[in-house]
Amino acid sequence: LPAQVAFTPYAPEPGGTCRLREYYDQTAQMCCSKCPPGQHAKVFCTKTSDTVCDSCEDSTYTQLWNWVPECLSCGSRCSSDQVETQACTREQNRICTCRPGWYCALSKQEGCRLCAQLRKCRPGFGVARPGTETSDVVCKPCAPGTFSNTTSSTDICRPHQICHVVAIPGNASMDAVCTSTSPTRSMAPGAVHLPQPVSTRSQHTQPTPAPSTAPGTSFLLPVGPSPPAEGSTGD
């Protein structure tokens, strides 16, 4: 004969566990129903009555089946330097991402606590490692035979043009100037053309999801924490 189906609340078998979407209530010593996402436990179960669930209030949410007495507060509104990629609903937290040209400078958990402007490499320096969602641009001095004449968070060092007759030799921040005969481009050492968009190893070993859950407090100030300060603006 099939085992009789137990309805919550019920006492579990000795050493047994409660079923999916149920929890063991220590006070009642019974298996009781969890509340679905978007709701919370308004009244806890007793030996004779099951959990009473209620909807989350505005600006609060629960994402999982639960028996919490209060829903979680959604994170603070996204700052002007962030973009809201997921609204706060009864079932999910607000998600903010750093706007283009910025990266997440501080995220110890899934939320981004601090967005920072991507470092710009000054003339004579090019991008050695592009910025990612969670790491800043790394600048490097342009190698001999290459130059960068821009202040940019994306430009790499480019090779000097090869002149039949040089009018002005190139340096790290300026291209060579040729006399009127048509120049050619060298592929000098260190002149690596990175395809756009660039995908390189970032400063973390596992991919971080692009969105970040809005934390309780969101600070947004320009920062440039990567060690190679030379070649960057803002010093």
């Epitope: 501080l106 110890k108 958990q109 606590r113 400063q203 924490p225 990567s226 060690p227």
Partner: antibody, heavy 117, light 106 residues
Amino acid sequence: QSVEESGGRLVTPGTPLILTCTVSGIDLSNYAMGWFRQAPGEGLEWIGSRRTDGITYYANWAEGRFTISRTSTTVDLEITSPTTEDTATYFCGRDVGGDGGWYFNLWGPGTLVTVSS
Amino acid sequence: AGDMTQTPASVEVAVGGTVTIKCQASQSINIYLAWYQQKPGQPPKLLIYDASKLASGVPSRFSGSGSGTEFTLTISDLECADAATYYCQQGINNIGFGGGTEVVVK
């Protein structure tokens, strides 16, 4: 609650070395951890930090030279190809927790690594 | 040691006196800064976090202030036990330490 580093010893350049940070009374699923070093007579230097979700941040200079990994009770630091410049006392630190700044309030006594031919 | 400039490198102060140590970040890090004390042969000890919050068990003689790029650690009513090296640390993903300040108590 305590943190203790081990595995420090004299190694020749290029010989990989794994340092182990063993924690007791700490649930590593709730705390981020960091590795640091201090050369004799020098200041503190951050190597890398591992979040509770496994994402690891490295100092730019340390990227590719060090690897941080974790078990339920240990956080390991591998020095992939040590050079004499890697001679230092290596510290493991436990982060304060939460989602704020990276701060470390529980440290091990350190383990000395000497790289010499 | 990251983009953190710490001054002075060394300071000598009499018992009961006050010492002020400054730390400058190359660009704004908001309030995400900590101060540590380290004595010879020992690991660092967290004193202050979020620029001004006192860590557990740290006496109120220690205080921190600042935000953005300029930060200060002040130790008042100096005691012999305060002789140590003090470090600032930026608390963002790319952690960096200042070069340290040796405090000598006369």
